[in-house]
């Protein structure tokens, strides 16, 4: 059980107050993290509270301002990037969000040597992506779907691609589906380590069906947003990878990197690109039926200036029990010999572990093993490999950082973080400087987050970077709920849950229960992290018990649990939430007449199906921006888990797993359906179809739409949303306002 933070004496209890909804909506108890912007082995940049860009040298202990807040303010810069030769800084302003990762901005180049902005050959606006070369100060940028390259910031640009067209051809940036479901970045170009070559992806969306929705705005007529968006089974983008030599860009055409024959024989995806050296690159490809991935290592052929990908350097990763990888196929981390690499994939027991591949995947040497999972490889140096896992004390929802000495035999393993601040910190990530000379640890909880700086050789803590003292003080007079993370064993399935309990929780009393669910494949909700959010308020002020349950399909507990949902989404995720609720009722402190469930996105789908399960367990529930049919969602995501919606594949389950098919079952529950009309991700169509089915079935329900809002329902909509959901739940649970 985790109690956070430690309670004060009873005599002080009368000065303490519960959380309010206003606290949550105002972000009163939000925390800060500190991620150094590393620029060398021992130096990093950080934006100070007063907006100066400061360079810190760990070894000398000195710091100085490289860019003043005055310069930042002169162009209203909200972000910056220092060129590797430290001669220039780009300043980013006029940020305009597009999708989850993508945005456009205006960029200015500031010359640090003369303290002036570079004049002449200024950058066009708005730019879709811009980055420095890894060495020197070459600039690559994407403007109007084409890639440009400047040898120096003041030079005129070389246009690298010419076929870019809005919503048709994307060069150096992903289209919607690749951004959201495959790359998880706003960019699709990659510099080689010394900046000699620039690789990029071209996405051809010419034949992709378009999703169109109204954006109401303030004009007399709404405008229509059109996005090439492949839904399950639809025509997909066609991807090609090219490499240009930046020494003489655009002299000859970009050189295409060949696709492995076994991949090219049917529809496929490109999944990632990793440079190994300036003349060796590693590409990962995936069949449209996403259980076969091929890692291809390609070499530059000097004589004809082309890229060669020999079959002997193709490594196949195949899953026979589910899809390839976890959420994504993992990426390789190459060792210093520039041919062998470390990679996370399933071992013979069905747990994701680090393997070392020297020649073939079949001969891979397993580096980690056990009934837990390696989650991320942070860095490989000459003598150490740093990774994170959930091994420690067998809690899947924890993350600790480990170091394996690969320079010695046998390799020895050390947990870097397990005992640092054991009660406060059980969920870490890390950020490493060049050659892992130093690293920052960022602890997310369960206590108040803290960021610290460490020596990469000795692991000694050098200093605290951010400890959230103000937050700690602010929380001293707040009655926070209690949290416990435990597990249920049901029919050979382990269901981990997090329970958030009212501050004065008494097991002999009965409490209303709210299930918060996400439940998507390869997700994890039960994590040892700090949060003061809406459900904290519901427990603290409104006296609800809130539970989060990781059922089948969730991550980091082995392939048996993860792949259980393969080709049958919407079945076991729902069953496991229901099973958990029954177990919670058995605990004796749940008022079984006051049980609700809510979720967002995939969670909205699961909550809807749970409400329509016919169990009679739930009095009410909320679905925010739910998927209602897998035929409406993106191909890349949906087909990974469901296959294709065709008769000879999995159409039957596509049809059986819709929310609409269960419309009748909503008759005996109170249902609140919420969606943004400008949701580019889970289209409003999903909720429109639920509403239509409920109306056709003559089932009463409540609904709220948010005009011109996307999947995040941000800004003022957030306040309205949580206020509205609070009223709904309080009414459902007969709690006075």
């Amino acid at each position: 059980i985790v109690l956070r933070p430690s309670r004060v004496h009873n005599s002080e209890e009368n000065t303490m107050r519960a959380l309010t909804l206003k606290d949550i909506l105002n972000g009163t108890f939000s925390y800060k993290t500190f991620f150094p912007n590393w620029i060398s082995g021992q130096e990093y940049l950080h934006q100070s509270a007063d907006n100066n860009i400061v360079l810190y040298n760990i070894e000398t202990g000195q710091s100085y301002t490289i860019l003043s807040n005055r310069t930042m303010k002169s162009v209203n810069a909200s972000n910056y990037g220092l060129s590797p030769d430290r001669q220039f800084v780009y300043l980013e302003s006029d940020y305009s969000k597009l999708w989850r990762y993508s945005y456009t901005a205006t960029y200015y180049i500031y010359d640090l040597s003369n303290g002036e902005f570079v004049r002449g050959n200024e950058l066009p606006r708005p730019i879709q992506y811009l980055c420095w070369s890894p060495v020197g100060s070459k600039l690559a940028y994407v403007y109007q779907n084409n890639i440009y390259l400047k040898q120096r910031p003041g030079d005129p640009p070389f246009q690298i691609t010419f076929n870019g067209r809005e919503n048709k051809i994307f060069n150096g940036i992903p289209d919607w589906v690749y951004e959201e479901e495959m790359l998880a970045t706003k960019y699709a170009l990659w510099w080689s380590p010394n900046g000699k070559f620039l690789a990029y992806a071209e996405f051809n969306d010419t034949d992709i069906p378009v999703i169109a929705y109204s954006y109401y705005g303030d004009e007399q007529y709404p405008r229509t947003i059109n996005i090439p968006y492949p839904k399950a089974g639809a025509k997909n983008p066609v991807v090609r990878i090219f490499i240009i030599d930046t020494t003489y860009p655009a002299y000859v055409g970009p050189q295409e990197v060949p696709v492995p024959a076994m991949i090219a024989s049917s529809d496929y995806y490109f999944s990632w690109l990793t440079w190994v050296t300036d003349e060796r690159v590693c590409l990962q490809w995936l069949k449209r039926v996403q259980n076969v991935s091929v890692l291809s290592i390609c070499d530059f052929r000097e004589d004809w200036q082309t890229w060669d990908c020999p079959k002997t350097q193709e490594h196949i990763e195949e899953s026979r029990t589910g899809w390839a990888g976890g959420f994504f196929v993992s990426t390789p981390v190459f060792s210093y010999d520039a041919i062998s690499y470390y990679k996370i994939f399933s071992d013979k027991d069905g747990y994701k572990h680090i393997h070392y591949i020297k020649d073939t995947v079949e001969n891979a040497i397993q580096i980690t093993s056990g009934k837990w999972e390696a989650i991320n490889i942070f860095r490989v140096t000459q003598d150490s490999l740093f990774y994170s896992s959930n091994e420690f004390e067998e809690y899947p929802g924890r993350r600790n950082i480990y170091r394996i000495s690969i320079g010695s035999y046998p390799p020895s393993k050390k947990c870097v973080t397990c005992h640092l601040r054991k009660e406060r910190c059980q969920y870490y990530t890390a950020s490493f400087s060049d050659y892992a000379k130093y690293y920052a640890l960022v602890c997310y909880g369960p206590g108040i987050p803290i960021s610290t700086l460490h020596d990469g050789r000795t692991d000694q803590e050098i200093k605290i970077l951010e400890e959230n003292k103000e937050l700690e003080n602010a929380l001293k007079n707040i009655q926070l709920p209690k949290e416990e993370i435990k597990k249920l064993e049901v029919d050979e399935i382990t269901l981990w849950y997090k329970m958030i309990l009212p501050p004065q929780f008494d097991r002999s009393k009965k409490y209303p229960l709210l299930i918060q669910v996400y439940g998507g494949p390869c997700s994890q909700s039960v994590r040892s992290v700090f949060a003061v959010n809406w459900i904290s308020y519901l427990a603290s002020k409104e006296g609800m018990v809130i539970a989060l349950v990781d059922g089948r399909g969730t991550a980091f507990q082995g392939d048996k649990l993860l792949y259980a949902v393969y080709r049958k989404l919407g079945v076991y995720e729902v069953e496991d939430q229901i099973t958990a609720v029954r177990k919670f009722i058995e605990m004796g402190f749940i008022d079984e007449k006051r049980i609700a469930i809510w979720g967002w996105s995939y969670g909205g789908y699961v909550s809807s199906l749970a409400l329509a399960s016919g169990t009679g367990l739930f009095k009410c529930g909320i679905a925010v921006a739910p998927v209602s049919s897998w035929e409406y969602y993106a191909s890349v995501y949906t087909e990974r888990f469901m296959g294709l919606p065709t008769k000879d594949d999995n159409l039957e389950h596509y049809k059986n797993s819709t929310v609409m098919a269960r419309a009748e079952y909503f008759r005996n529950v109170d249902y609140l359906l919420i969606h943004g009309t400008a949701d580019d991700n889970v289209h409003f169509q999903n909720s429109a179809q639920i509403a239509k089915a409920l109306v056709n079935a003559q089932v009463d329900f409540q609904a709220m739409w948010y005009s011109d809002q996307n999947h995040g329902l941000s800004g003022l909509s957030t306040n309205h949303l949580y206020t509205h959901m609070t009223h709904f739940l309080k009414q459902c649970f007969s709690l006075s306002d």
Epitope: Q151, F158, Y251, V252
Partner: antibody
Framework: QVQLQESGPGLVKPSETLSLTCTVS??????????WSWIRQSPGKGLEWIGF???????NYNPSLKSRVTISVDTSKNQFSLKLSSVTAADTAVYYC????????????WGQGTTVTVSS | EIVLTQSPATLSLSPGERATLSCRAS??????LAWYQQKPGQAPRLLIY???NRATGIPARFSGSGSGTDFTLTISSLEPEDFAVYYC?????????FGQGTKVEIK
């Protein structure tokens, strides 16, 4: 508009070095938007790309001539030059300099060409 | 290197007729192909870039098409000044190479 003019000896002895200069007028070799190329045309071989230079000094040459070619630039004189060593009769050709806008736009401005004969 | 084969070697036509010149690459050059016109005693002149785009000042009777390995230069109606040698050039791979040329002569 931009004009290019080749100059240099019309006759070179075998085994010697052929040297040609291209003078750019109405534009600048320092313009970062262009490459400056040399091409030759011999009756036997048709048009043959020799190589190019960028104002920064970056060069690239045809692999078949690489060991004998040097292209250089003199931004102060707004000129770029070609040197071809160890010439033989097979190097007899009309030599052209051209402004080159890269793979997409091609070689859009050419000099009128200069004939070089290799003979003793 | 990529070999460009132009055909026919010679095309004998009368003014006003349509000329169709072919350029075939030994491997795909995408659309990175240009066409040049050369008259006796003159330097080559850029006609078409990126397989199908007319260069500045080139009359509309000249058009280019094709991608991959097969390309065509079409002169819809020959004018007297169009009788010349036409070269294709690929910019897809190192080194850039030219075809051997097609001579369009007056019949």
């Amino acid at each position: 508009q931009v004009q290019l003019q080749e100059s240099g000896p019309g006759l070179v002895k075998p085994s010697e070095t052929l040297s040609l200069t291209c003078t750019v007028s109405g534009g600048s070799v320092s313009s970062g938007s262009y490459y400056w190329s040399w091409i030759r045309q011999s009756p036997g071989k048709g048009l043959e790309w020799i190589g190019f230079i960028y104002y920064s000094g970056n060069t690239n040459y045809n692999p078949s001539l690489k060991s004998r070619v040097t292209i250089s630039v003199d931004t102060s004189k707004n000129q770029f030059s070609l040197k071809l060593s160890s010439v033989t009769a097979a190097d007899t050709a009309v030599y052209y300099c051209a402004r080159d806008r890269g793979y997409y736009y091609g070689m859009d401005v050419w000099g009128q060409g200069t004939t070089v004969t290799v003979s003793s | 290197e990529i070999v460009l084969t132009q055909s026919p070697a010679t095309l004998s036509l009368s003014p006003g007729e349509r000329a169709t010149l072919s350029c075939r690459a030994s491997q795909s050059v995408s659309s990175y192909l240009a066409w040049y016109q050369q008259k006796p005693g003159q330097a080559p002149r850029l006609l078409i870039y990126d397989a199908s785009n007319r260069a500045t000042g080139i009359p509309a009777r000249f058009s280019g098409s094709g991608s991959g390995t097969d390309f065509t230069l079409t002169i819809s109606s020959l004018e007297p000044e169009d009788f010349a040698v036409y070269y294709c050039q690929q910019r897809s791979n190192w080194p850039p190479t030219f075809g051997q040329g097609t001579k369009v002569e007056i019949k």
